[in-house]
């Protein structure tokens, strides 16, 4: 008996070959007996069968010998055995129809589990082994789950499934709802404008939800909420902003705050979530700013910066063109009695300069200038 | 030329069963339907069920199932309707038909009157 | 089970004029560009005899005055010019799907 797989809301088609290369007399019947179709002539009749309307074959191969019997939309429940009469010979075949679907949606947010449930007829022992995007392979039986879903879960998983060393292949559409980044550090110096941008790592046709950005300042005892928006259909609209500091919020995707400028108090970090509707959970981004300040007192240049600094992040002070004078892993650094010249604040990691300050200091009877 | 030629005539009590036989001759018996139909008498037609004479595969009405049974014999060319439990409803003229191109019913047999009658 | 409602139940047409029989369908008999409806003559103590198979197409034999239309659930049965050896019950049926089913039959005499 030949075994055919079929995918449930696929069309599959059944072979029947007659050794007279001619339209004769067929008929297609299930296992109980009941008549599929079969024809009258160079015509089809259709039997009583729960498939009538889904039921087709192709008249055009009959003068061939063949008889195919096609089934459209089909339905786990069309497992069955088929059998094609054709002269006086039959034909059976096994038709084993499976369904693969995940649990609920295919658009989960980061950090959730994906269930992919297999459907499958009375009596088959299937097994399935699916593949993410990200080239990860995972085996089950009727249930497969992902936890802790990643970025790089996005895209195409292609599941197979194999039954009597036959396999059928289903690709199923994975979106994962997240920020591009998890996590982003801003680096200005006092008095810049800073921009904060918040790029989804997804598209979809209407995008519907509510945000809110939580700052905690480096300087502060707790968090304050700075800014609260709505999302409609990718439009953005403010809810609530604080005074101070007062952030503008961009009306289209993606998400982007201004800061109209980077001062010490403001240095910290915050974390913009973004709750989508008939989702469960939030999605988040953390992001930090780094604000530094050079200034000279009297006989004294300092060089410091405020926020979520890593411990390896070097602070300098040079003179331009020459060797740094101080060179520390601290948040602040500073020189006694400077030369006059244009005096350089850096703030690099491995030799990469991540922000930078001038100061000009002036002969000792002029006070100092800030370019 | 086809031809369907059926049994004579039956006169059965209620309870009983009939079985008309129908010979066909002037084509290869195997290679078409034949269907029953039967009318009551000044009524319409009415499907009883067919049979393939190549595999012996029979559909019926689901109005007669499990009344009615359909049966050939390749050696006579020859196919056979018994219909079981007899009412006097079922007083009828039973036909049998051959299949053709777009059609169920190109060639009839005579007909055969059965009566149920007490 | 798909019904076919015939009408008129009867009919009494002059010689040489047009008889027309309808016959609806309770759903469409159409399959593939093809209209499964069938139109048979019965004569008293006569096996019922075709017509016209597939909406249209007129059985061998059969003189051209009768002609089939119709497509989806409506077809008809027109005889052109009435002769005397067309007086019979004339039946449509469909063959589409089992069970192959008939309408009640409309008997044609003449006036």
């Known amino acids: 008996k030949k075994v055919v797989l079929g995918k449930k809301g696929d069309t599959v088609e059944l072979t029947c070959t007659a050794s007279q290369k001619k339209s004769i007399q067929f008929h297609w019947k299930n296992s109980n007996q009941i008549k599929i179709l079969g024809n009258q002539g160079s015509f089809l009749t259709k039997g009583p069968s729960k498939l009538n309307d889904r039921a087709d074959s192709r008249r055009s191969l009959w003068d061939q010998g063949n008889f195919p019997l096609i089934i459209k939309n089909l339905k786990i429940e069309d497992s069955d055995t088929y059998i094609c009469e054709v002269e006086d010979q039959k034909e059976e075949v096994q038709l084993l129809v499976f369904g693969l679907t995940a649990n609920s949606d295919t658009h989960l947010l980061q950090g959730q589990s994906l269930t992919l449930t297999l459907e499958s007829p009375p009596g088959s022992s299937p097994s399935v082994q699916c593949r993410s995007p990200r080239g990860k392979n995972i085996q089950g039986g009727k249930t497969l789950s992902v936890s802790q879903l990643e970025l790089q879960d996005s895209g195409t998983w292609t599941c197979t499934v194999l039954q009597n060393q036959k396999k059928v292949e289903f690709k199923i559409d994975i979106v994962v709802l997240a920020f591009q980044k998890a996590s982003s550090i801003v680096y200005k110096k006092e008095g810049e404008q800073v921009e904060f941008s918040f790029p989804l790592a997804f598209t979809v046709e209407k995008l519907t939800g509510s945000g809110e950005l939580w700052w905690q300042a480096e300087r502060a005892s707790s968090s304050k909420s700075w800014i609260t928006f709505d999302l409609k259909n990718k439009e953005v609209s403010v809810k609530r902003v604080t005074q101070d500091p007062k952030l503008q919020m961009g009306k289209k995707l993606p998400l982007h705050l201004t800061l109209p400028q980077a001062l010490p108090q403001y240095a910290g970090s915050g974390n913009l979530t973004l709750a989508l509707e008939a989702k469960t959970g939030k999605l988040h981004q953390e992001v930090n700013l780094v604000v530094m300040r050079a200034t000279q007192l009297q006989k004294n240049l300092t060089c410091e910066v405020w926020g979520p600094t890593s411990p390896k992040l070097m602070l300098s002070l040079k003179l331009e063109n020459k060797e740094a004078k101080v060179s520390k892993r601290e948040k602040a650094v500073w020189v006694l009695n400077p030369e006059a010249g244009m005096w350089q604040c850096l703030l690099s990691d491995s030799g990469q300069v991540l922000l930078e300050s001038n100061i000009k200091v002036l002969p000792t009877w002029s006070t100092p200038v800030q370019p | 030329q086809v031809q369907l030629v059926q049994s004579g005539a039956e006169v059965k009590k209620p309870g009983a069963s009939v079985k008309v036989s129908c010979k066909a001759s002037g084509y290869t018996f195997t290679a078409y339907v034949i269907s029953w139909v039967r009318q009551a008498p000044g009524q319409g037609l009415e499907w009883m069920g067919e049979i393939y004479p190549g595999s012996g595969s029979s559909y019926y009405n689901e109005k007669f199932k499990g009344r009615v049974t359909n049966t050939r014999d390749t050696s006579t060319s020859t196919v056979y309707m018994e219909l079981s439990s007899l009412r006097s409803e079922d007083t009828a003229v039973y036909y049998c038909a051959r299949s053709g191109d777009g059609s169920r019913f190109v060639y009839w047999g005579q007909g055969t009157l059965v009566t149920v009658s007490s | 089970d798909i019904v076919m409602t015939q009408s008129p139940d009867s009919l009494a047409v002059s010689l040489g004029e047009r008889a027309t029989i309808n016959c609806k369908a309770s759903?469409?008999?159409?399959?593939?560009?093809?209209?499964?409806s069938n139109w048979y003559q019965q004569k008293p103590g006569q096996p019922p005899k075709l017509l016209i198979y597939?909406?249209?197409n007129l059985e061998s034999g059969v003189p051209d005055r009768f002609s089939g239309s119709g497509s989806g659930t409506d077809f008809t049965l027109t005889i052109s010019s009435l002769q005397a050896e067309d007086v019979a019950v004339y039946y449509c049926?469909?063959?589409?799907?089992?069970?192959?089913?008939f309408g009640g039959g409309t008997k044609v005499e003449i006036k």
């Open positions: 759903q469409s008999v159409d399959y593939d560009g093809d209209s499964y």
């Open positions: 597939v909406a249209s």
């Open positions: 049926q469909q063959s589409l799907q089992d069970p192959p089913t």
